[in-house]
């Protein structure tokens, strides 16, 4: 099934001019994601049932090994490149989580809805970050890594990997919102 964000190698051939106040829009999107991240995390681990709600540190700790790094003290250009990588990673991961949850928790409609809404904002954020990188810094290509594919995991591992990712998402989005 298609992931919500499937970026190709970026080129600076932007079809439409970038929005005015692009950085303000990026900040606004980050603030929006930060404002809903904890609610999404709670909604997720609650929907998984036991043992998740009572073992958050063990099962949902933000220990995601291959997560792209972010350095808050870098230049705007460096921060945007790192933000781009993070948004791509989060987007593909969220796509995997959404696909898994539709199978594992088909009746958790509020969770599905929140996952989809988050993916929509991430899509817009990715577009704006790319626009800024192209228009101001002429960066047309960023090497990216994608979130782990959970297709070949058992039920428990699917749930655990999703919980860890959303724990990491909650943590990193607060850092990103602060950094911009």
């Amino acid at each position: 099934s298609p992931l919500p964000i499937t970026p190709v190698n970026a080129t600076c051939a932007i079809r439409h001019p970038c929005h005015n106040n692009l950085m303000n829009q990026i900040r606004s999107q980050l603030a929006q994601l930060n404002g809903s991240a904890n609610a999404l995390f709670i909604l997720y681990y609650t929907a998984q049932g036991e043992p998740f709600p009572n073992n958050l540190d063990k099962l949902c700790g933000p220990n995601v090994t291959d997560f792209p790094p972010f350095h808050a003290n870098g230049t705007e250009k460096a921060k945007l490149v790192e933000l781009y990588r993070i948004v791509v990673y989060l987007g593909t991961s969220l796509g995997n989580i959404t696909r898994d949850q539709k199978i594992l928790n088909p009746s958790a409609l509020s969770l599905h809805s929140k996952l989809n809404a988050t993916a929509d904002i991430l899509r817009g954020l990715l577009s704006n970050v790319l626009c800024r990188l192209c228009s101001k810094y002429h960066v047309g290509h960023v090497d990216v890594t994608y979130g782990p594919d959970t297709s070949g995991k058992d039920v428990f591992q699917k749930k655990k990997l999703g919980c860890q990712l959303l724990g990491k998402y909650k943590q990193i989005i607060a850092v990103l919102a602060q950094a911009f």
């Epitope: 049932g49 043992p51 199978i103 070949g152 995991k153 058992d154 039920v155 591992q157």
Partner: antibody, heavy 120, light 110 residues
Framework: EVQLVESGGGLVQPGGSLRLSCAAS?????????MSWVRQAPGKGLEWVSS?????????YYADSVKGRFTISRDNSKNTLYLQMDSLRAEDTAIYYC????????????WGQGTLVTVS | DIQMTQSPSSLSASVGDRVTITCRAS??????LNWYQQKPGKAPKLLIY???SLQSGVPSRFSGSGSGTDFTLTISSLQPEDFATYYC????????????FGGGTKVEIK
């Protein structure tokens, strides 16, 4: 008709090797599917042996009792599942069933007829 | 590590009897518990999946219930073709130390 047919069972000496095959028909291995091996010693219950995801990642899982000795694999182009069994022991004597499951593979909705492996 | 315990290991019953078999997981497996029927010389057959869903083609006298750690298979009115061995199976985790199947319950004619 969806069908699984196992082959490759037989008599083997302790320490020997055997390769089981399971040919699937009526569905494609390229879909979001799981294949497993489940065994049953004479007069005993069912024991899960190993599973593989036939999608891109090819994730594999093994029971403690066979880990390091058995290897599960698949050939999607031939729609065939394999179980390479090395360092066989007397306690590996059993009927080996091939079983299939839709993702997320929490139940086995398709079974082969089984093939007997005797280690003696 | 998940361990599956099935009880009783065998039972004797008559045609028309209501039969109940239980399965307990050592830790929560949510609703990922399945039931199989096996007759001598045959492969197992899926009866109930995800605790309570009846597999297509399985008679409605078979039902399943439970969640978390305790599960039950009920045959409301035992028929001659129901004399067989029944197994529970957890589909939650396939870690190498996890126990996937219960030990089985043999249903015999009284």
């Amino acid at each position: 008709e969806v069908q699984l047919v196992e082959s490759g069972g037989g008599l083997v000496q302790p320490g020997g090797s055997l390769r089981l095959s399971c040919a699937a028909s009526g569905f494609s291995f390229s879909t979001d599917y799981w294949m497993s091996w489940v065994r049953q010693a004479p007069g005993k219950g069912l024991e899960w042996v190993s599973s593989i995801y036939v999608g891109t990642s090819g994730d594999t899982y093994y029971a403690d009792s066979v880990k390091g000795r058995f290897t599960i694999s698949r050939d999607n182009s031939k729609n065939t599942l394999y179980l390479q069994m090395d360092s066989l022991r007397a306690e590996d004597t059993a009927i080996y069933y091939c079983a299939g499951a839709d993702n997320p593979y929490d139940y086995f909705n398709l079974w082969g007829q089984g093939t007997l492996v005797t280690v003696s | 590590d998940i361990q599956m315990t099935q009880s009783p290991s065998s039972l004797s019953a008559s045609v028309g009897d209501r039969v109940t078999i239980t399965c307990r997981a050592s830790e929560t497996i949510s609703g990922y518990l399945n039931w199989y029927q096996q007759k001598p010389g045959k492969a197992p057959k899926l009866l109930i999946y995800r605790a309570s869903s009846l597999q297509s083609g399985v008679p409605s006298r078979f039902s399943g219930s439970g969640s978390g750690t305790d599960f039950t298979l009920t045959i409301s009115s035992l028929q001659p073709e129901d004399f067989a061995t029944y197994y529970c199976q957890q589909g939650y985790s396939y870690s190498d130390t996890d126990n996937v199947f219960g030990g089985g319950t043999k249903v015999e004619i009284k």
